[in-house]
């Protein structure tokens, strides 16, 4: 009765696939992660605009900091 | 490996149309978008637009809007660009570059399109 | 649109030299900035992504790093090949936009 599945989202012009999990599997936090990890092969990469996607790990670091 | 094969230079008169194409291989074509650029002989890059894969929609930059389309045929993981009207101006190298995590990150080599009477 | 301010427009420098060149942000973009190196035969291949990650096989000797909204491309010891042109893009917000180049010449 654990299951976790991915679905598309829809943001701005891209898509970008997000993990919508099952609120049981919440509860076993490592097995979460390891399928999240699974999952990662349906990420796409649509906008080339880091600020229309979610894709992205967006940067805001401010003053040079890093 | 991943790679953007583009077809051959074309040379082109006043008022053609011209389509190059972009064949992607080593990765899933729908899954990244794919971007256009534009080199003037001895000028920089411009960003044309990009296609997003999945849902064939055109995004095309403000200077790029009325004669250029952006199409795919995914059977056959190709994108291409149509130049419609052609005109001197639009003698240009033409790249294609996917859409990667942090922009785009690969590259086609390039089309040279000359336009000239 | 941002505007990139990339200078030097040219540079002749040695082999074994140390150079770098910058790139200048007319608004915040954060760290969402890419160098590329362009070959004679127009062959583009992306060197430095998110202001200071190498993509992989690109040689050490590159580096990228930012102060403020300046970034900046390092090459430490300049080596035959690294003669061509090069080129920073955002890719923070829409219209992606290019500094207008660098062209490293060998001394």
């Known amino acids: 009765f654990l299951f976790h599945y991915s679905k598309t989202q829809k943001l701005g012009k891209s898509n970008v696939v997000s993990s919508v999990v099952h609120p049981l599997l919440q509860l076993v936090p490592h097995l979460h992660e390891r399928r999240m990890k699974r999952f990662r092969v349906d990420e796409e990469f649509q906008s080339p605009f880091a600020s229309q996607s979610r894709g992205y790990f967006l940067f805001r670091p401010r003053n040079g900091r890093r | 490996q991943i790679q953007l094969v583009q077809s051959g230079p074309e040379l082109k008169k006043p008022g053609e149309t011209v389509k190059i194409s972009c064949k992607a291989s080593?990765?899933?074509?729908?899954?990244?978008?794919m971007n256009w650029m534009k080199q003037a002989p001895g000028k920089g890059l411009k960003w044309m637009g990009w296609?997003?894969?999945?849902?064939?929609?055109?995004t095309y930059s403000e200077e790029f809007k009325g004669r250029f389309a952006f199409s795919l045929e995914t059977s056959a993981s190709t994108a291409y660009l149509q130049i419609n009207n052609l005109k001197n101006e639009d003698t240009a190298t033409y790249f294609c570059a996917r859409t990667g995590r942090y922009g785009v990150d690969y590259w086609g080599k390039g089309t040279s399109v000359t336009v000239s009477s | 649109d941002i505007q990139m301010t990339q200078s030097p427009s040219s540079l002749s420098a040695s082999l074994g030299e140390r150079v770098s060149l910058t790139c200048r942000a007319s608004?915040?973009?954060?760290?969402?900035l890419n160098w590329i190196q362009q070959e004679p035969d127009g062959t583009i291949k992306r060197l430095i992504y998110?202001?200071?990650t190498l993509d992989s096989g690109v040689p050490k000797r590159f580096s990228g790093s930012r102060s403020g909204s300046d970034y900046f491309l390092t090459i430490s010891s300049l080596e035959s090949e690294d003669f061509v042109d090069y080129y920073c893009?955002?890719?923070?917000?829409?219209?992606?936009?290019f500094g207008a180049g660098t062209k490293l010449e060998l001394k």
């Open positions: 080593g990765y899933t074509f729908t899954k990244h978008g």
């Open positions: 893009l955002q890719f923070d917000s829409s219209p992606l936009t």
């Open positions: 296609i997003n894969t999945n849902t064939g929609e055109p």
């Open positions: 998110a202001t200071s």
């Open positions: 608004q915040d973009i954060g760290s969402n």
